[in-house]
């Protein structure tokens, strides 16, 4: 921004009123008027360049200083060039002196040169010569100097004549604020620019209305340079929470908008299954029926527990179910889909039903499922099973219904024993199994069936009530097709599968583990 | 036995609307979700929309968004397809379809079909 | 959206002889494919469901099997009344999609 120049003192707009002081009186410093463009003009010209040693003086009246730190003298003049004089004037001079005195009362027609300080010689940049002169072409002279930091009331300039030919067209005397300022949505006062050249004021900024410093942000601040001119912002103030900039203010939200917090975003327009907003709203409210998790922000629709998994089917496998489902048609507008799967076992005979979670093996944890599988082993035979899968999303938690679907499944079988060969000689194989521990108190007995490979004509049967056998009176080097079934109340249980088994040759003889 | 029974098809400029109606019966019309589904002239299948149970949730094929809107009527066992701003590749036979019980396979059931012709 | 891709428009055989439709899936739809059979002039009915299960109803000439992406329909032994066109659908995540069609005829 453009310094603020406050002035102090004009002579030229003054026209000719102000009757500076002149020392000595009568002689040098001469007020006279001229006419330009029909305007009278004032001017105070001094031309002794014929005598030797001119001390002459022009000062100005008093000028009250006010908040001035520093001042800027502006001066247009004339300088006429020594060698337009005859002879060359060797007296003749083609600069003269700039002082100020301070001072806390107008001492009037007091003069006292010792009182006074030089500021600075000043020397045309342009001299009028003759033809110049004669032909009314007069070369016009800016300078400008500035004096600081002043301390008193007021203060005295005064122009010492040394035997120039000087015409002092305008003085203007003013000082520089840096002005009044909105940027950053805070506002900067006026403020008077400082005096010293190397250093700049920090001035403090106010947050217009409805603006706020954002958390852990920096006051505003600006610095006033010495020109008037503001330099380096720090800091700045963001519209709060419901309301947007607009220019330079913050400006209400419009109704059906919102904003959530202090930041430079515009008001947004409230979200999906939100209701209309009021004017200078932080949020929107959610529908009815529609939610938002505390980790949701604001600008995320409102949303809704997902419905249930769409398609569920339990597929058995032995003393297994495989439980696979399909994702909700209604994922409630939200990505954070988990499910939940429950067991329930029911006894055909009694009817009664209860929780088998504790009996149950599931392939992963059955809680906060992302896959839409999952296996179920370990289930006992001659039992009904239903699962439950439950959907879940962000904010099911805000509600009490569920969305679940169930599926329900008969476990008609035990799971197939797992057979191993413990031992074996030239005739005999030891043979031992095993079933999940649910399944074994269902079991009455095991049926041991082994036949000779390539002879389907016959085979063997042994029951026992134990997890292993042996099988005698076989022939040596012989391979043997080996089966183990569950017998339960109910009937036979899953099979196992067929396994090859070899006796020892009578070579290899002597009962060898395997 | 379940039976879905379309109505309301015919020939309609572009542009025009039509409402097609699916009467419902054998089974608890309220516990299911419904659904249309069309095949062009080249036998191409294609769901067009899906209703919940309680018609508190409707999903839409992307090119219908916006011109169609799928309603349920539970105490009358109707399903309704409004169509609006009819273009020519909404040329189809239209079905409702049910899913199979306690959803354990989808499309079980299938209307006859209504025909839908939209031509100028 | 999922895309089911049934690369043979057409499949020519004869009564008794054993086919195989296929049908792809554009992403795993963890075995929730659905087969169709369409006779000229009737409504689509259901066959297959979760890839294997086969609707109530259907003869036991109809097999469904498949996981992950690829699919298929085997029909053990085509009789007279199986020219049809057969349509596979993903019934995993919506838009439910279905293949284009296979139309098998009978030499």
């Known amino acids: 921004a453009q310094g603020k120049e406050v002035v102090l003192l004009d002579f030229a707009a003054a026209g000719g009123e102000l009757g500076w002081l002149t020392h000595p009186y009568g002689k040098g410093w001469d007020l006279m008027q001229n006419i330009m463009n029909d305007m009278p003009i004032y001017m105070y010209s001094v031309c002794n360049v014929m005598s030797g040693d001119q001390d002459n003086w022009l000062r100005t009246n008093w000028v009250y200083r006010g908040e001035a730190e520093r001042i800027f003298i502006e001066l247009k003049f004339t300088v006429r060039d020594c060698n337009s004089f005859p002879g060359g004037a060797s007296s003749c001079k083609e600069t003269f002196n700039l002082y100020y005195a301070e001072s806390d009362l107008d001492y009037g027609t007091n003069f006292q040169k010792r009182l006074f300080t030089k500021i600075d010689t000043i020397a045309p940049d342009e001299i009028t010569v003759s033809s110049d002169f004669e032909a009314r072409h007069v070369k016009l002279n800016v300078e400008e100097r500035s004096v600081g930091p002043l301390t008193r009331k007021g203060f005295y300039l005064a122009f010492q004549d040394i035997g120039a030919c000087v015409a002092l067209l305008s003085v203007r005397v003013y000082y520089k604020k840096c002005p009044e300022l909105l940027q950053g949505l805070a506002h900067f006062p006026e403020t008077i620019a400082g005096s010293d050249a190397p250093s700049l004021a920090t001035v403090a900024g106010t947050c217009v209305d409805h603006a706020v410093v954002p958390p852990g942000g920096e006051e505003p601040r600006m610095h006033c340079a010495v020109d008037g001119e503001w330099l380096v912002p720090i800091g700045q103030c963001l519209c709060q929470a419901g309301y947007e900039k607009v220019e330079d203010a913050c400006q209400a939200c419009s109704p059906g908008f919102f904003k959530f917090e202090a930041s430079e975003s515009p008001c947004l327009e409230c979200p999906e299954h939100t209701l209309p907003s009021p004017e200078g709203a932080t949020s929107c409210e959610c529908e009815e029926g529609f939610f938002r998790a505390p980790q949701d922000p604001a600008s995320m629709p409102c949303t809704r527990p997902p419905s249930a998994p769409h398609y569920l089917t339990a597929v058995g496998m032995g003393a297994k179910v495989e439980l696979r489902w399909t994702p909700p048609q209604d994922s409630g507008g939200r990505e954070d889909i988990v499910y939940s799967v429950t067991c329930e076992q029911c006894w055909p005979e009694s009817g009664e039903c209860g929780p088998c979670e504790a009996s149950v093996r599931y392939s992963e944890p059955p809680h906060g499922l992302t896959r839409t599988s999952v296996t179920v082993s370990d289930l006992e035979p001659h039992m009904n099973y239903t699962f439950t899968v439950e959907a879940r999303n962000g904010v099911s938690g805000l509600v009490t219904s569920r969305s679940f679907r169930t599926a329900s499944v008969s476990i008609n079988q035990t799971e197939p024993p797992k057979v191993r060969l413990e031992g074996r000689s030239t005739t005999s194989l030891s043979v031992s199994w095993s079933i999940p521990p649910p399944q074994q108190s269902r079991v009455w007995k095991y049926e041991v069936t082994y036949r000779k490979k390539g002879d389907s004509n016959s085979y063997n049967v042994r029951r026992t009530e134990g997890f292993s056998v042996t099988l005698d009176d076989l022939a040596p080097d012989t391979t043997y097709l080996v089966q183990v079934q569950a017998l339960t109340q109910e009937g036979q249980g899953a099979g196992s599968k067929v396994h090859e088994f070899q006796t020892l040759s009578p070579e290899g003889s002597g009962n060898l583990a395997v | 036995e379940v039976q879905l029974v379309e109505s309301g098809g015919g020939l309609v400029k572009p542009g025009g609307s039509l409402k097609l109606s699916c009467e419902a019966s054998?089974?608890?019309?309220?516990?299911?979700?419904m659904y249309w589904v069309r095949q062009t002239p080249e036998k191409r299948l294609e769901w067009v929309a899906t209703i919940s149970d309680d018609g508190s949730f409707t999903h839409y094929l992307d090119s219908v968004k916006g011109r169609f809107t799928i309603s349920r009527d539970n105490a009358q066992n109707n399903l309704y397809l409004q169509m609006s701003s009819l273009k020519s590749d909404d040329t189809a036979m239209y079905y409702c379809?049910?899913?199979?019980?306690?959803?354990?396979?989808?499309?079980?059931?299938w209307g006859q079909g209504t025909l839908v012709t939209v031509s100028a | 959206d999922i895309v089911m891709t049934q690369s043979h428009k057409f499949m020519s055989t004869s009564v008794g002889d054993r086919v195989r439709i296929t049908c792809k899936a554009s992403?795993?739809?963890?075995?929730?494919v659905a087969w169709y059979q369409q006779k000229p002039g009737q409504s689509p009915k259901l066959l297959i469901y979760?890839?294997?299960t086969r609707h109530t109803g259907v003869p036991d000439r109809f097999t469904g099997s498949g996981s992950g992406t690829d699919y298929s329909l085997t029909i053990s032994s085509v009789q007279a009344e199986d020219l049809a066109l057969y349509y596979c659908?993903?019934?995993?995540?919506?838009?439910?999609?279905f293949g284009g069609g296979t139309k098998l005829e009978i030499k």
């Open positions: 054998g089974f608890t019309f309220s516990d299911y979700y």
């Open positions: 659908q993903q019934h995993y995540s919506t838009p439910y999609t």
């Open positions: 379809a049910r899913d199979g019980y306690r959803y354990d396979r989808p499309f079980a059931y």
């Open positions: 979760w890839a294997s």
């Open positions: 992403q795993d739809v963890n075995t929730a």
